[in-house]
């Protein structure tokens, strides 16, 4: 069989092979589509219901005046020519429509580094048969379920027309420290081949890098925290981020009732200033981040360091800050 | 809402002619083939005359053929059937249908109108 | 031409029955038949097209079916108003022929 692919709409002319250019005529066409059970035959002298779908010329060609979904099938002519010598012609027939231009809706301006992100919806409407949809990143085809990459498709056929409505969401996770701008596009590629793709318009959402918290840095002088009693510890709370966050103190996981200051100092030591100290820096965007603990501790005279496990009293003797 | 309305109709003597309208409203008139049935007490329902969207195309039965014209207005959306040679066995409620090929079976109907040839 | 042979002329039931009306068709006329209700003093009314679709709005308890050359329609559980008269046609080929109706009435 002869393949015919036709546009959904538009006319078709299936000529009948040897058969005499005008009346009489001894010719048939048979007919099984979509709108047959079986065979359904129209003769040149025929006319009827079936005209606004398909009927036959005088030169004996089948013309289809509006092809639809329904007419997707295959198509016999058999005809006798003058002289009693049979022909036969037979076509098999599939139908196209092209959609509007696809379009990317419901599109995120900003994404953000390091998570998952919606970048939007593509929808094509009004194709046959179904075709596919597909996602670019820089002009490249995204694979889904690579790299961060997942895609959530669905389809839907119109109960009238019979015509198909493709939806696509692409979900991205950006990589850190990647393109600023990416350049996001999805195209719709036919169900039926020798037609291009339609690509929609590019969208380039900006990301957004989240910046990494840097650790709260806590410095105890004299090293290593030990010190002899009637001694000075001096904590300092060295924070990178700007604007300067407030910082808090806090020993065996107790808030001190202080100011806040990125300096803390404990002098003349004595047996309640021993315990685990950290600090606090809370930032306004980002909310509170807990230094590294350090244990502060009495040394005994004659002995080498901090006391193993020592555990500080509850008073805090006499304090100052910086 | 679809509506069609028949007027036209009346009492006539054999043979002589009578003209059928029929308004339609609610529906895109020219994407449409019309059609004229006819109904008689005796015969049941009968086909009467066909016409395609364009109006390029005309169908009837041998028992009207050559007496009987059916035509359309697309820009007035009407559809007339004009009855020449009337003959009492014509006498019937005429009705005007939408539809008349395969892909739209006689959905809507108009209320009809009363044909009756008679001396 | 095409001869739509349908039976019975007429039936007398009762209401909540189940009721089926054929026609036969001397050709092949695929899937294109429907059939028509008209309530005395009214224009016909589509209740089944090409065969088996039940037309919009009418009632789940109609239905249509086809095996082979001969056309069903039925109505389950009858009600007071489906007292009618029921028409089948083809519409596959000219003439279009219509059946000669089935008069349906309550006992």
């Known amino acids: 069989a002869q393949n015919i692919t036709a546009r959904i709409g538009e006319p078709l002319v299936l000529k009948c092979k040897g058969a005499p250019k005008k009346p009489p005529q001894r010719l048939e066409w048979k007919l099984n589509t979509g709108r047959t059970e079986a065979w359904k035959v129209l003769s040149p002298q025929g006319g009827g219901p079936w005209d606004s779908v398909a009927r036959v010329l005088p030169n004996g060609s089948l013309f289809l005046p509006a092809v639809g979904i329904q007419d997707e099938g295959i198509f016999r002519c058999q005809a006798m020519n003058r002289n009693g010598k049979e022909t036969k012609s037979n076509y098999r027939v599939r139908v196209y429509q092209i959609p509007g231009k696809p379009e990317i809706v419901d599109s995120a301006s900003e994404l953000t580094a390091g998570v998952p992100n919606k970048v939007g919806t593509c929808v094509s409407e009004g194709s046959y048969p179904a075709g596919t949809l597909s996602w670019h990143l820089d002009g490249k085809p995204l694979v889904p379920n690579e790299k961060g990459v997942s895609v959530k498709e669905q389809t839907r056929r119109h109960p009238e027309t019979g015509l198909f409505t493709l939806q696509s969401e692409l979900m991205v996770t950006p990589a850190r420290g990647g393109d600023p701008r990416p350049t996001f596009s999805c195209s719709f590629s036919p169900g039926l081949p020798r037609h291009r793709a339609l690509r929609t318009a590019p969208i380039q959402p900006r990301v957004w890098e989240p910046v990494p918290l840097e650790e709260v840095q806590l410095v105890v002088e004299p090293e290593g925290g030990a010190v002899a009693p009637g001694g000075t510890v001096t904590l300092t709370c060295e924070v990178p981020a700007q604007p300067s966050p407030q910082i808090h103190w806090m020993k065996d996981g107790v808030p001190l009732p202080l100011p806040p200051s990125p300096v803390l100092i404990l002098p003349e030591i004595g047996p309640q200033d021993q315990g685990t100290y950290s600090c606090v820096a809370t930032h306004s965007s980002h909310g509170p981040q807990e230094s590294r603990a350090v244990s502060i501790s009495i040394i005994e005279p004659g002995e080498e360091g901090p006391t193993a496990g020592s555990v500080g009293g509850s008073g805090l003797g006499t304090l100052a800050l910086a | 809402e679809v509506q069609l309305v028949e007027s036209g109709g009346g009492l006539v003597q054999p043979g002589r002619s009578l003209k059928l309208s029929c308004v339609v409203s609610?529906?895109?008139?020219?994407?449409?083939?019309m059609t004229w049935i006819r109904q008689t007490p005796g015969k049941g329902l009968e086909w009467v005359a066909s016409?395609?969207?364009?109006?390029?195309?005309?169908y009837y039965p041998d028992s009207v053929k050559d007496r009987f014209t059916i035509s359309r207005d697309n820009a007035k959306s009407t559809l007339y059937l004009q009855m020449n040679s009337l003959r009492s066995e014509d006498t019937a409620t005429y009705y005007c249908?939408?539809?008349?090929?395969?892909?739209?079976?006689?959905?809507?109907w108009g209320q009809g109108v009363m044909v009756t040839v008679s001396s | 031409d095409i001869q739509m042979t349908q039976s019975p002329s007429s039936m007398s039931v009762s209401l909540g029955d189940t009721i089926t009306i054929t026609c036969r068709a001397s050709?092949?006329?695929?899937?294109?038949v429907n059939w028509f209700q008209q309530k005395p003093g009214k224009s016909p009314r589509r209740m089944i097209y090409?065969?088996?679709n039940l037309a919009d709005g009418v009632p789940s308890r109609f239905s249509g079916s086809r095996s082979g050359s001969i056309y069903s329609l039925t109505i389950s559980s009858l009600e007071s108003e489906d007292v009618a008269d029921y028409h089948c046609?083809?519409?596959?080929?000219?003439?279009?022929?219509f059946g000669s109706g089935t008069k349906v009435e309550i006992k």
């Open positions: 609610g529906f895109t008139f020219n994407n449409y083939w």
């Open positions: 050709q092949d006329v695929g899937i294109y």
């Open positions: 016409i395609d969207n364009s109006g390029d195309n005309t």
């Open positions: 249908t939408r539809g008349g090929d395969i892909t739209t079976g006689f959905d809507y």
């Open positions: 090409r065969a088996t």
């Open positions: 046609l083809e519409f596959d080929e000219h003439p279009l022929t």
